[in-house]
Interface confidence: low
């Protein structure tokens, strides 16, 4: 039910092209093809470079892209734009100057001197954003976004972008200046996932990231329980960046046992950061063997 | 530093019960199963069964049901294994693995 | 049950040269999952036993890297590239995949 037809406007189209993406690269990275059948593998990428090319109508003179040709560029969206296609870079051909051309937008044209970066054009589709809908903590929260698509795309673009090794340093010094002063769980999932990734999450920042989690096991606000699988994901994957493999468990159990499989309105976030989490975790975790995962059943499986 | 401390020798009479401890430290207790393992002297390795101390759940090799018994305790972060009826075949080193092991516990089935 | 058999049953090795040990399962032991959970023990004399490989080639920390794990399927190989003093004992495999684990009889590795 992941594998769909992308369609519609510029947002629309990055909505049906997120599963798909995402279940294509959970299924390589866990190599299960074969329990789904590995001829639906090429139907798959059909379908994504069908709304990579869907999308690149979107893409402004600027490299940014927006809902409409003719609408504001949005700095969320070209963000996730970014996102999506650094996963997909080894699964279809991207032209990396797309791709870093919407780096070097979002660098140049958004990012503010104390490294926060600003949305001048909030996307139309707003359940798309997940937890980010309604955040009080916004700037927090978008940089961190920001910030973790840039890093997906270092490597891609570093070279095309001389800017992006500065304008990641930046953001990162704004997001552990403010770290302590999180209110919301979603909040310090997301941003300790970016601190995480830059090797910034420790100390005080540390403490405050694992004590935020409830019953150690999930990073949750009220409200929306697709927001907290959302940020639970964020988190697991700044835990396997940690290498904290003792706190792992408890936090893929608790995904597991949300039985959430992406798909339906407004899962846009929560389906891409679930299967990208729980892909690191098959990839980093130690042993499945013996690491006890297996909470819905009474025997144990290995 | 990861342990799993496992209870002293014992010498027991034929018939009678046996109950053993492994004491985990320096990881959380509820990540991992516990397998317990019987190494009869001079000889190779024998797997008794597993426990989930997250939930208790176990699962035995068919050869040992009936004759050990698995359980947890996850406020002291150990697991029990219970052997009863002994004979003189029950004679071994017991180990528990999680997948780090236990220093064994030796069991002596002697009138 | 799934039977695993070792061989040699000993091996005299002088120090500083490789060593290879087999160990062939009766079944695959290739999982549903896709993994294949082999894994290899070393029991130094008088000791408890001490995981040094699962999931065929992994390396659990501290293990040298001296030591590989290969093999699927049914034939898998645990190689040693110059042997060292510390690495006599007895080394075993065992497999995870089906119900029960089953060990193979244990291999001695003996400095010449």
């Known amino acids: 039910h992941l594998i769909v037809t992308p369609s519609g406007c510029g947002e629309q189209n990055m909505i049906g092209m997120t599963p798909t993406v995402i279940a294509v690269h959970y299924l390589d990275e866990t190599e299960q093809w074969e329990k789904f059948g590995l001829e639906k593998r090429q139907g798959a990428l059909e379908l994504i470079k069908k709304g990579y090319t869907q999308q690149l109508a979107f893409r402004q003179p600027s490299s940014a892209f927006a809902a409409f040709v003719k609408r504001a560029p949005s700095t969320w969206l070209t963000a996730y734009v970014v996102k999506v296609f650094s996963l997909a870079v080894n699964l279809i051909a991207i032209d990396s100057q797309v791709l870093c051309g919407a780096v070097k937008w979002l660098i140049l044209e958004k990012q503010k001197p104390d490294g926060v970066f600003q949305e001048d054009a909030p996307v139309i589709h707003q359940e798309m954003i997940g937890g980010l809908r309604n955040n009080n903590e916004k700037d927090m929260a978008l940089t961190a976004f920001v910030l973790i698509s840039l890093q997906e795309a270092k490597d891609i673009c570093e070279e095309q972008v001389n800017s992006l090794p500065g304008s990641i340093t930046k953001a990162g010094d704004f997001l552990e200046a403010n770290y302590m002063n999180l209110q919301r769980s979603y909040t310090v999932a997301i941003a300790g996932y970016a601190l995480a990734q830059m090797g910034r999450l420790k100390g005080p920042l540390l403490n405050k990231f694992l004590t935020t989690a409830k019953d150690k096991n999930r990073w949750e606000d009220p409200g929306k329980q697709l927001y907290n699988v959302e940020a639970t994901s964020y988190a697991l994957l700044a835990l396997l960046q940690l290498k904290d493999f003792d706190f792992v468990p408890p936090v893929v159990r608790w995904l597991n046992e949300q039985r959430y499989y992406g798909g339906g309105y407004g899962s846009t976030q929560a389906t891409f950061m679930v299967f990208q989490a729980l892909a690191q975790y098959q990839k980093d975790a130690p042993d499945h063997q013996e690491l006890n995962l297996d909470v819905s059943l009474q025997l144990p499986s290995r | 530093e990861v342990q799993l401390q496992q209870s002293g020798p014992v010498l027991v009479k034929p018939g009678a019960s046996v109950k053993m401890s492994c004491k985990a430290s320096?990881?959380?207790?509820?990540?991992?199963?516990i397998n317990w393992v019987k190494q009869s002297h001079g000889k190779s390795l024998e797997w008794i069964g597993v426990i989930n101390p997250y939930n208790g759940g176990t699962s035995y090799n068919q050869k040992f049901k009936g004759k050990a018994t698995l359980t947890v305790d996850k406020s002291s972060s150990t697991a029990y294994m219970e052997l009863n009826s002994l004979t003189s075949e029950d004679s071994a080193v017991y180990f528990c693995?999680?997948?780090?092991w236990g220093q064994g516990t030796s069991v002596t089935v002697s009138s | 049950d799934v039977v695993m058999t070792q061989t040699p049953l000993t091996l005299s090795v002088t120090i500083g040269q490789p060593a290879s040990i087999s160990c062939k399962s009766s079944?695959?032991?290739?999982?549903?999952?896709?993994?294949?959970?082999l894994n290899w023990l070393l029991q130094r004399p008088g000791q408890s036993p001490k995981r040094l490989i699962y999931l065929v080639s992994k390396l659990d920390s501290g293990v040298p890297d001296r030591f590989t794990g290969s093999g699927s399927g049914t034939d898998f190989t645990l190689k040693i590239s110059r042997v060292e003093a510390e690495d006599l004992g007895v080394y075993y495999c065992?497999?995870?995949?089906?119900?029960?684990?089953?060990f193979g009889g244990g291999t001695k590795l003996e400095i010449r």
């Open positions: 320096g990881y959380t207790f509820t990540n991992y199963y």
């Open positions: 693995s999680s997948p780090y």
């Open positions: 065992w497999q995870g995949t089906h119900f029960p684990r089953t």
């Open positions: 079944q695959s032991l290739l999982d549903s999952d896709g993994k294949t959970y």
